[in-house]
């Protein structure tokens, strides 16, 4: 007889979840010589632990602290950009501007990012058929936890200055509901971060507008001012020339407004 | 450029009020906050607000009861409202744009217009 | 409120020289510091914010250092065109607070 299985209302893992992990803990540690004493198969047993056997609307940062503990690293805590609705900008940003630092250029953040995982209660199995949505099943999933536990963390090791890119193309430019707004944005420490510094990425050719007007900016503004945070906005009007003028900073068109 | 010019000094009586006006051109203030800040004759310098550029403000517990900052972003002109002035009130008042869109701190500063407060 | 205090409140060095420039504040404003220099008769000007952060166009012989309660202001080579009076800026809490300014002149 089949055993009965439950059904999310998510997409399943990730396809050779396992084998994935492993492959990319293997080549982000060859690639990054800081990181050469991570040992992988540690990596990937503490990710399986922090999930297996355990009901997937109840897990906890409690169980990702044993990876947490395993993926430590250090980066330059001025240098952090953060992103929300405008991952694939951001990412290719960090790898002109080599010297700053998404979450996803950090090991746990890259052996994570665009996979989908989660377990069944009181078996090994890990469940390809379904996990669950955050909004229709449960916040507590594995994969909602595992990036709150690792953004928070991120957001308390940054310093100075941080940068944050945000997508000026939807309804809401700053959202209370994503991961930025509601995980990052109150882990910044004041005591370390003087500043949070908004790019605010236009989508269309002729949009001239001042999207640091918008009232979903002006409630981050008052959100980060009343952390004692300071606030400043800035509008990238060109995405592509903002990029291509980070890779060609003395070409004579990056001087005018971007 | 970016510039800030102060006006409306000059002497009046204690106890009378005055209104300064800092009128900002090279930038508007729907972007950047402005600060006002005093000096007497020969002392050192003492906050009094800022107006943030949505309107909200913040003062020194000194000046709350007597002063209001306030502003016409059509006009891009900030100004100070003074009122119950005592002699202790004479100084130097600069007004003064902050760096980035909400910060404590002043890049670029007007030449200040002299408060007499006298009888 | 948070009191700010430069030391020396004036003093006197030849060109060339490394002049150094204290403020301390009653409580811990981790890197919430900026500097100012005002010449007589004129509106101060931002040379330093973020305890260490040099402002554009401000000359690279001006530098600051420190964080929690205790800052330093250096010219690294004094020049003629730095007589002024220079105050540190609290921007940790309101009320904002200045120390009393450091008066330097030219021996």
């Known amino acids: 007889v089949p055993r009965w299985r439950q059904q999310w209302s998510g997409p399943g893992t990730t396809k050779r979840f396992p084998e994935t992990v492993l492959a990319r803990c293997v080549k982000y540690t060859e690639i990054h010589p800081e990181m050469r004493h991570v040992d992988c198969q540690s990596v990937w047993d503490a990710f399986k632990g922090a999930f297996i056997s355990k009901h997937p609307c109840n897990i906890t940062e409690e169980d990702y602290q044993p990876l947490m503990k395993l993926g430590t690293q250090t980066v330059p805590c001025n240098k952090i950009l953060l992103w929300s609705r405008i991952k694939d900008l951001a990412h290719q940003f960090t790898q002109v501007q080599r010297d700053m630092f998404t979450l996803e250029d950090t090991l746990l953040g890259y052996l994570a990012d665009d996979l989908t995982w989660c377990g069944e209660f009181n078996t090994s199995k890990i469940n390809y058929q379904s996990c669950p949505d955050w909004r229709k099943d449960c916040s507590n999933n594995p994969v909602s936890v595992f990036w709150k536990t690792v953004s928070r963390r991120f957001a308390e090791a940054a310093c100075d200055v941080v940068h944050v890119m945000l997508n000026g193309s939807r309804s809401k430019i700053f959202d209370k509901n994503s991961t930025f707004g509601s995980v990052e944005v109150h882990n910044l420490q004041p005591e370390k971060v003087q500043t949070l510094e908004a790019w605010v990425i236009h989508g269309g050719r002729e949009d001239s507008r001042d999207l640091c007007q918008d009232p979903t900016i002006k409630e981050l503004e008052s959100i980060i001012s009343k952390r004692n945070i300071q606030f400043s906005c800035k509008n990238i009007y060109r995405p592509d020339k903002f990029l291509q003028c980070v890779k060609n900073p003395e070409d004579s068109s990056c001087t005018s407004e971007i | 450029q970016v510039q800030l010019v102060e006006s409306g000094g000059g002497v009046v009586q204690p106890g009378r009020s005055l209104r300064l006006s800092c009128a900002a051109s090279?930038?508007?203030?729907?972007?950047?906050?402005v600060h006002w800040v005093r000096q007497a004759p020969g002392k050192g310098l003492e906050w009094v607000a800022v107006?943030?550029?949505?309107?909200?403000?913040d003062y020194s517990a000194a000046f709350m009861s007597r002063f209001t900052i306030s502003k016409d972003n059509s006009k891009n002109t900030v100004y100070l409202q003074m009122n119950s002035l005592r002699a202790e009130d004479t100084a130097v008042y600069y007004c003064?744009?902050?760096?980035?869109?909400?910060?404590?701190?002043?890049?670029?500063w007007g030449q200040g217009t002299l408060v007499t407060v006298s009888s | 409120d948070i009191q700010m205090t430069q030391s020396p409140s004036s003093l006197s060095a030849s060109v060339g020289d490394r002049v150094t420039i204290t403020c301390k504040s009653s409580?811990?404003?981790?890197?919430?510091l900026a500097w100012y220099q005002q010449k007589p008769g004129k509106a101060p000007k931002l040379l330093i914010y973020?305890?260490?952060s040099l402002e554009t166009g401000v000359p690279s012989r001006f530098s600051g250092s420190g964080s929690g309660t205790d800052f330093t202001l250096t010219i690294s080579s004094l020049q003629p065109e730095d007589v002024a009076t220079y105050y540190c800026?609290?921007?940790?809490?309101?009320?904002?607070?200045f120390g009393q300014g450091t008066k330097v002149e030219i021996k």
């Open positions: 003064a744009k902050t760096t980035l869109t909400r910060v404590w701190y002043c890049d670029v």
């Open positions: 090279g930038f508007s203030l729907t972007n950047y906050g």
């Open positions: 107006i943030w550029r949505g309107g909200s403000t």
């Open positions: 409580e811990d404003i981790y890197n919430r």
């Open positions: 973020g305890a260490t």
């Open positions: 800026q609290q921007y940790w809490n309101t009320p904002l607070t």
